[in-house]
Protein backbone atom coordinates (compact mmCIF):
# COMPACT_ATOMS: atom_id res chain seq x y z
CA UNK A 1 0.00 0.00 0.00
CA UNK A 2 1.36 3.42 -0.98
CA UNK A 3 1.96 5.87 1.83
CA UNK A 4 0.20 9.21 1.92
CA UNK A 5 2.81 11.83 1.12
CA UNK A 6 2.73 14.99 3.22
CA UNK A 7 2.55 18.25 1.33
CA UNK A 8 5.89 19.97 0.97
CA UNK A 9 6.53 23.35 2.49
CA UNK A 10 8.25 26.30 0.87
CA UNK A 11 10.05 29.28 2.35
CA UNK A 12 12.47 31.92 1.13
CA UNK A 13 15.69 33.24 2.60
CA UNK A 14 16.26 36.01 3.52
CA UNK A 15 12.57 36.68 2.83
CA UNK A 16 9.95 37.18 0.13
CA UNK A 17 10.63 40.87 -0.54
CA UNK A 18 13.97 41.09 -2.31
CA UNK A 19 15.79 44.14 -3.69
CA UNK A 20 16.56 44.09 -7.39
CA UNK A 21 19.95 42.44 -7.96
CA UNK A 22 20.07 40.69 -4.60
CA UNK A 23 19.87 36.94 -4.09
CA UNK A 24 17.10 34.74 -2.80
CA UNK A 25 17.09 31.09 -1.85
CA UNK A 26 13.91 29.03 -1.93
CA UNK A 27 13.86 26.17 0.58
CA UNK A 28 11.63 23.17 -0.08
CA UNK A 29 11.00 20.62 2.66
CA UNK A 30 9.51 17.14 2.66
CA UNK A 31 9.95 13.75 4.31
CA UNK A 32 13.15 11.70 4.38
CA UNK A 33 13.60 9.72 1.17
CA UNK A 34 12.57 12.42 -1.29
CA UNK A 35 14.51 11.72 -4.49
CA UNK A 36 13.70 14.90 -6.40
CA UNK A 37 12.56 18.31 -5.26
CA UNK A 38 11.05 20.60 -7.87
CA UNK A 39 10.59 24.36 -7.65
CA UNK A 40 7.80 25.49 -9.96
CA UNK A 41 6.64 28.86 -11.20
CA UNK A 42 2.93 29.58 -11.54
CA UNK A 43 2.93 27.73 -14.83
CA UNK A 44 4.01 24.14 -14.25
CA UNK A 45 6.01 24.27 -17.47
CA UNK A 46 8.74 26.35 -15.83
CA UNK A 47 10.60 24.54 -13.11
CA UNK A 48 13.94 23.46 -11.72
CA UNK A 49 14.79 20.06 -10.26
CA UNK A 50 17.43 18.96 -7.79
CA UNK A 51 18.43 15.67 -6.20
CA UNK A 52 20.91 17.41 -3.88
CA UNK A 53 18.97 16.78 -0.69
CA UNK A 54 19.95 17.49 2.91
CA UNK A 55 18.60 16.54 6.29
CA UNK A 56 16.51 19.33 7.78
CA UNK A 57 15.71 17.25 10.86
CA UNK A 58 15.61 13.55 11.75
CA UNK A 59 12.27 13.29 9.95
CA UNK A 60 12.61 15.90 7.19
CA UNK A 61 14.69 16.54 4.11
CA UNK A 62 15.18 19.80 2.28
CA UNK A 63 16.53 21.23 -0.94
CA UNK A 64 17.62 24.75 -1.79
CA UNK A 65 17.22 26.69 -5.01
CA UNK A 66 19.16 29.93 -5.28
CA UNK A 67 18.61 32.83 -7.64
CA UNK A 68 21.80 34.84 -7.50
CA UNK A 69 20.67 38.15 -8.92
CA UNK A 70 16.95 38.79 -8.77
CA UNK A 71 15.29 40.65 -11.62
CA UNK A 72 11.71 41.81 -12.15
CA UNK A 73 11.14 38.66 -14.17
CA UNK A 74 11.72 36.57 -11.06
CA UNK A 75 8.77 38.14 -9.25
CA UNK A 76 5.68 36.02 -8.85
CA UNK A 77 4.41 32.85 -7.23
CA UNK A 78 6.57 29.79 -6.57
CA UNK A 79 5.72 26.40 -5.15
CA UNK A 80 7.43 23.09 -4.40
CA UNK A 81 6.59 19.53 -5.29
CA UNK A 82 8.64 16.40 -4.72
CA UNK A 83 9.02 12.87 -6.01
CA UNK A 84 9.22 10.07 -3.48
CA UNK A 85 8.91 6.77 -5.33
CA UNK A 86 6.56 5.71 -6.63
CA UNK A 87 4.72 9.02 -6.91
CA UNK A 88 4.78 12.79 -6.84
CA UNK A 89 3.47 14.73 -3.89
CA UNK A 90 0.85 17.43 -3.93
CA UNK A 91 2.13 20.94 -4.47
CA UNK A 92 2.97 23.21 -1.58
CA UNK A 93 1.15 26.46 -1.04
CA UNK A 94 2.30 29.28 -3.30
CA UNK A 95 4.94 31.69 -2.05
CA UNK A 96 4.88 35.11 -3.69
CA UNK A 97 8.25 36.69 -4.44
CA UNK A 98 8.19 40.48 -4.56
CA UNK A 99 11.06 42.36 -6.16
CA UNK A 100 11.82 45.86 -4.90
CA UNK A 101 13.56 48.28 -7.20
CA UNK A 102 15.23 49.94 -8.70
CA UNK A 103 17.49 50.25 -5.66
CA UNK A 104 21.20 50.22 -5.07
CA UNK A 105 22.48 46.66 -4.72
CA UNK A 106 23.17 45.93 -1.04
CA UNK A 107 26.60 44.80 0.11
CA UNK A 108 27.47 41.42 -1.39
CA UNK A 109 27.47 38.60 1.16
CA UNK A 110 28.41 35.94 -1.37
CA UNK A 111 31.74 35.51 0.41
CA UNK A 112 29.94 33.47 3.01
CA UNK A 113 31.30 30.01 2.23
CA UNK A 114 28.01 28.43 3.26
CA UNK A 115 25.91 30.53 0.91
CA UNK A 116 24.51 28.53 -1.98
CA UNK A 117 25.43 29.70 -5.45
CA UNK A 118 23.23 30.88 -8.25
CA UNK A 119 20.63 28.72 -9.94
CA UNK A 120 17.83 30.46 -11.79
CA UNK A 121 14.76 28.74 -13.14
CA UNK A 122 14.69 27.83 -16.80
CA UNK A 123 11.65 27.42 -19.02
CA UNK A 124 13.15 24.55 -20.97
CA UNK A 125 11.60 21.73 -18.94
CA UNK A 126 8.12 20.96 -20.20
CA UNK A 127 5.67 18.33 -18.98
Amino acid sequence: QEEDLPRPSISAEPGTVIPLGSHVTFVCRGPVGVQTFRLERESRSTYNDTEDVSQASPSESEARFRIDSVSEGNAGPYRCIYYKPPKWSEQSDYLELLVKGPTQRPSDNSHNEHAPASQGLKAEHLY
Epitope: G33, V34, D52, S59, R64, H114, P116, Q119
Partner: antibody, heavy 119, light 107 residues
Framework: EVQLVESGGGLVQPGGSLRLSCAAS????????MNWVRQAPGKGLEWVAR??????????FYADSVKDRFTISRDDSKNSLYLQMNSLKTEDTAVYYC??????????WGQGTTVTVSS | DIQMTQSPSSLSASVGDRVTITCLAS??????LGWYQQKPGKAPKLLIY???SLAEGVPSRFSGSGSGTDFTLTISSLQPEDFATYYC?????????FGGGTKVEIK
Protein backbone atom coordinates in the same frame (compact mmCIF):
# COMPACT_ATOMS: atom_id res chain seq x y z
CA GLU B 1 21.69 3.79 -18.01
CA VAL B 2 23.62 5.40 -15.18
CA GLN B 3 27.38 4.92 -15.54
CA LEU B 4 30.21 6.02 -13.27
CA VAL B 5 33.67 5.14 -14.52
CA GLU B 6 36.67 5.78 -12.28
CA SER B 7 40.24 6.14 -13.51
CA GLY B 8 43.60 7.37 -12.29
CA GLY B 9 44.44 4.69 -9.74
CA GLY B 10 47.85 3.08 -9.57
CA LEU B 11 50.98 2.51 -7.53
CA VAL B 12 52.49 5.51 -5.78
CA GLN B 13 55.15 5.96 -3.10
CA PRO B 14 54.32 7.30 0.37
CA GLY B 15 54.23 11.08 0.28
CA GLY B 16 53.29 11.07 -3.38
CA SER B 17 50.21 12.38 -5.18
CA LEU B 18 47.51 10.94 -7.40
CA ARG B 19 44.42 12.37 -9.08
CA LEU B 20 41.37 10.20 -9.51
CA SER B 21 38.68 10.96 -12.08
CA CYS B 22 35.11 9.77 -12.47
CA ALA B 23 33.26 10.12 -15.76
CA ALA B 24 29.48 10.21 -15.26
CA SER B 25 26.79 9.53 -17.83
CA UNK B 26 23.14 8.54 -18.05
CA UNK B 27 21.81 11.16 -15.63
CA UNK B 28 21.74 14.91 -15.04
CA UNK B 29 25.07 15.25 -13.30
CA UNK B 30 24.74 18.83 -12.11
CA UNK B 31 21.70 18.22 -9.88
CA UNK B 32 23.38 15.56 -7.72
CA UNK B 33 25.81 15.71 -4.86
CA MET B 34 28.70 13.29 -5.44
CA ASN B 35 30.97 11.28 -3.16
CA TRP B 36 34.13 9.22 -2.94
CA VAL B 37 34.07 6.08 -0.81
CA ARG B 38 37.02 3.74 -0.30
CA GLN B 39 37.58 0.19 0.82
CA ALA B 40 40.95 -1.04 2.07
CA PRO B 41 41.84 -4.65 1.21
CA GLY B 42 39.70 -7.02 3.31
CA LYS B 43 38.11 -4.11 5.20
CA GLY B 44 34.80 -2.31 5.30
CA LEU B 45 33.55 0.82 3.55
CA GLU B 46 34.83 4.28 4.48
CA TRP B 47 33.29 7.50 3.22
CA VAL B 48 36.04 9.86 2.03
CA ALA B 49 34.55 13.07 0.64
CA ARG B 50 31.40 14.73 -0.66
CA UNK B 51 30.76 17.69 -2.95
CA UNK B 52 27.43 19.42 -3.33
CA UNK B 53 25.87 21.21 -6.28
CA UNK B 54 26.02 24.81 -7.45
CA UNK B 55 22.95 25.54 -5.30
CA UNK B 56 25.23 24.98 -2.30
CA UNK B 57 28.26 26.75 -3.78
CA UNK B 58 29.91 23.36 -4.37
CA UNK B 59 30.39 22.88 -0.63
CA UNK B 60 32.83 20.09 0.26
CA PHE B 61 33.07 17.71 3.21
CA TYR B 62 35.84 15.28 4.19
CA ALA B 63 36.56 12.40 6.52
CA ASP B 64 39.02 13.39 9.24
CA SER B 65 41.48 10.80 7.94
CA VAL B 66 41.94 12.69 4.65
CA LYS B 67 41.24 16.30 5.61
CA ASP B 68 43.93 18.73 4.39
CA ARG B 69 45.42 16.02 2.13
CA PHE B 70 42.60 15.22 -0.30
CA THR B 71 40.53 17.64 -2.39
CA ILE B 72 37.24 16.74 -4.07
CA SER B 73 36.12 18.79 -7.06
CA ARG B 74 33.72 18.57 -9.99
CA ASP B 75 33.36 19.93 -13.51
CA ASP B 76 29.69 19.99 -14.41
CA SER B 77 30.47 20.93 -18.02
CA LYS B 78 32.39 17.65 -18.36
CA ASN B 79 30.13 15.52 -16.15
CA SER B 80 33.22 14.66 -14.14
CA LEU B 81 34.20 14.22 -10.50
CA TYR B 82 37.77 14.35 -9.21
CA LEU B 83 39.78 13.47 -6.12
CA GLN B 84 43.21 15.04 -5.76
CA MET B 85 45.19 12.98 -3.24
CA ASN B 86 48.37 14.46 -1.77
CA SER B 87 50.79 13.32 0.96
CA LEU B 88 49.61 9.75 0.44
CA LYS B 89 50.11 7.22 3.23
CA THR B 90 50.21 3.43 3.14
CA GLU B 91 46.85 3.40 4.91
CA ASP B 92 45.31 5.16 1.89
CA THR B 93 45.71 1.92 -0.07
CA ALA B 94 42.20 0.97 -1.15
CA VAL B 95 39.68 0.65 -3.92
CA TYR B 96 38.15 4.10 -4.46
CA TYR B 97 34.53 4.31 -5.59
CA CYS B 98 32.76 7.25 -7.20
CA UNK B 99 29.21 7.44 -5.84
CA UNK B 100 26.15 9.36 -6.98
CA UNK B 101 24.13 10.77 -4.13
CA UNK B 102 20.36 10.63 -4.59
CA UNK B 103 17.90 11.67 -1.89
CA UNK B 104 20.96 11.93 0.34
CA UNK B 105 21.62 8.19 -0.13
CA UNK B 106 24.35 6.44 -2.12
CA UNK B 107 22.24 5.21 -5.01
CA UNK B 108 24.77 4.46 -7.74
CA TRP B 109 28.38 3.28 -7.49
CA GLY B 110 31.18 3.00 -10.00
CA GLN B 111 33.21 -0.20 -10.21
CA GLY B 112 36.16 1.41 -8.44
CA THR B 113 39.82 2.17 -9.11
CA THR B 114 42.66 0.72 -7.06
CA VAL B 115 45.19 2.94 -5.31
CA THR B 116 48.28 1.27 -3.85
CA VAL B 117 50.63 3.31 -1.67
CA SER B 118 53.88 1.44 -1.16
CA SER B 119 57.61 1.99 -1.27
CA ASP C 1 30.90 11.57 14.96
CA ILE C 2 28.03 9.11 14.81
CA GLN C 3 29.17 5.52 15.32
CA MET C 4 27.30 2.72 13.60
CA THR C 5 27.46 -0.70 15.27
CA GLN C 6 26.34 -3.65 13.18
CA SER C 7 25.61 -7.13 14.47
CA PRO C 8 26.36 -9.88 13.99
CA SER C 9 29.65 -9.43 12.14
CA SER C 10 28.99 -12.73 10.37
CA LEU C 11 26.31 -15.38 10.22
CA SER C 12 25.73 -18.73 8.55
CA ALA C 13 22.34 -19.47 7.07
CA SER C 14 20.64 -21.76 4.60
CA VAL C 15 18.60 -20.98 1.50
CA GLY C 16 15.05 -20.20 2.59
CA ASP C 17 16.05 -18.95 6.04
CA ARG C 18 14.83 -15.66 7.46
CA VAL C 19 17.85 -13.47 8.21
CA THR C 20 17.95 -10.38 10.42
CA ILE C 21 20.83 -7.90 10.70
CA THR C 22 20.78 -5.04 13.17
CA CYS C 23 22.43 -1.65 13.19
CA LEU C 24 22.71 0.67 16.18
CA ALA C 25 23.47 4.38 15.84
CA SER C 26 25.29 6.16 18.67
CA UNK C 27 22.80 9.04 18.46
CA UNK C 28 19.41 9.57 16.88
CA UNK C 29 19.42 9.78 13.09
CA UNK C 30 15.69 9.63 12.45
CA UNK C 31 15.32 7.53 9.31
CA UNK C 32 18.52 8.73 7.62
CA LEU C 33 19.80 5.18 7.21
CA GLY C 34 20.73 3.12 4.18
CA TRP C 35 21.52 -0.58 3.72
CA TYR C 36 23.95 -1.85 1.08
CA GLN C 37 24.85 -5.27 -0.29
CA GLN C 38 28.36 -6.05 -1.52
CA LYS C 39 29.55 -9.18 -3.27
CA PRO C 40 33.27 -10.06 -3.53
CA GLY C 41 35.09 -7.96 -6.13
CA LYS C 42 32.00 -5.86 -6.84
CA ALA C 43 30.80 -2.40 -5.91
CA PRO C 44 28.21 -2.05 -3.17
CA LYS C 45 24.54 -1.80 -4.17
CA LEU C 46 21.86 0.23 -2.41
CA LEU C 47 19.09 -1.99 -1.03
CA ILE C 48 17.14 0.20 1.38
CA TYR C 49 17.08 3.98 1.80
CA UNK C 50 15.34 6.16 4.37
CA UNK C 51 15.41 3.12 6.71
CA UNK C 52 12.38 1.43 5.15
CA SER C 53 12.16 2.30 1.44
CA LEU C 54 13.13 -0.37 -1.07
CA ALA C 55 15.57 0.84 -3.72
CA GLU C 56 14.69 0.46 -7.37
CA GLY C 57 15.03 -3.09 -8.65
CA VAL C 58 15.56 -4.68 -5.24
CA PRO C 59 13.51 -7.83 -4.54
CA SER C 60 10.69 -7.50 -2.02
CA ARG C 61 12.21 -10.19 0.23
CA PHE C 62 14.45 -7.40 1.52
CA SER C 63 12.92 -5.02 4.04
CA GLY C 64 14.11 -2.41 6.49
CA SER C 65 12.66 -1.18 9.73
CA GLY C 66 13.47 1.13 12.60
CA SER C 67 14.02 4.80 13.35
CA GLY C 68 15.98 6.87 15.80
CA THR C 69 18.89 4.65 16.83
CA ASP C 70 17.81 1.04 16.19
CA PHE C 71 17.50 -0.41 12.69
CA THR C 72 16.98 -3.82 11.14
CA LEU C 73 17.51 -5.33 7.71
CA THR C 74 15.47 -8.49 7.11
CA ILE C 75 15.74 -11.01 4.29
CA SER C 76 12.50 -12.96 4.49
CA SER C 77 13.67 -15.99 2.54
CA LEU C 78 17.38 -16.16 1.77
CA GLN C 79 18.24 -16.90 -1.86
CA PRO C 80 21.57 -18.20 -3.23
CA GLU C 81 22.38 -14.76 -4.68
CA ASP C 82 21.95 -13.12 -1.26
CA PHE C 83 25.17 -14.53 0.18
CA ALA C 84 27.19 -11.33 0.49
CA THR C 85 28.31 -8.68 2.96
CA TYR C 86 25.77 -6.10 4.15
CA TYR C 87 26.53 -2.61 5.44
CA CYS C 88 24.41 0.05 7.11
CA UNK C 89 25.21 3.74 6.76
CA UNK C 90 23.97 6.87 8.46
CA UNK C 91 23.43 9.91 6.24
CA UNK C 92 22.23 12.27 8.93
CA UNK C 93 25.49 14.16 9.43
CA UNK C 94 29.05 14.19 8.16
CA UNK C 95 31.19 12.19 8.44
CA UNK C 96 28.80 9.75 6.74
CA UNK C 97 29.70 6.62 8.67
CA PHE C 98 29.18 2.95 7.78
CA GLY C 99 28.70 -0.01 10.04
CA GLY C 100 31.43 -2.64 10.13
CA GLY C 101 29.53 -5.04 7.90
CA THR C 102 27.79 -8.39 8.26
CA LYS C 103 28.99 -11.30 6.16
CA VAL C 104 26.20 -13.75 5.32
CA GLU C 105 27.68 -17.16 4.53
CA ILE C 106 26.25 -20.49 3.43
CA LYS C 107 25.68 -22.93 6.27
Amino acid sequence: EVQLVESGGGLVQPGGSLRLSCAASGFTFNINAMNWVRQAPGKGLEWVARIRTKNYNYATFYADSVKDRFTISRDDSKNSLYLQMNSLKTEDTAVYYCVRDRAGFFAYWGQGTTVTVSS
Amino acid sequence: DIQMTQSPSSLSASVGDRVTITCLASQTIGTWLGWYQQKPGKAPKLLIYAATSLAEGVPSRFSGSGSGTDFTLTISSLQPEDFATYYCQQLYSTPLTFGGGTKVEIK
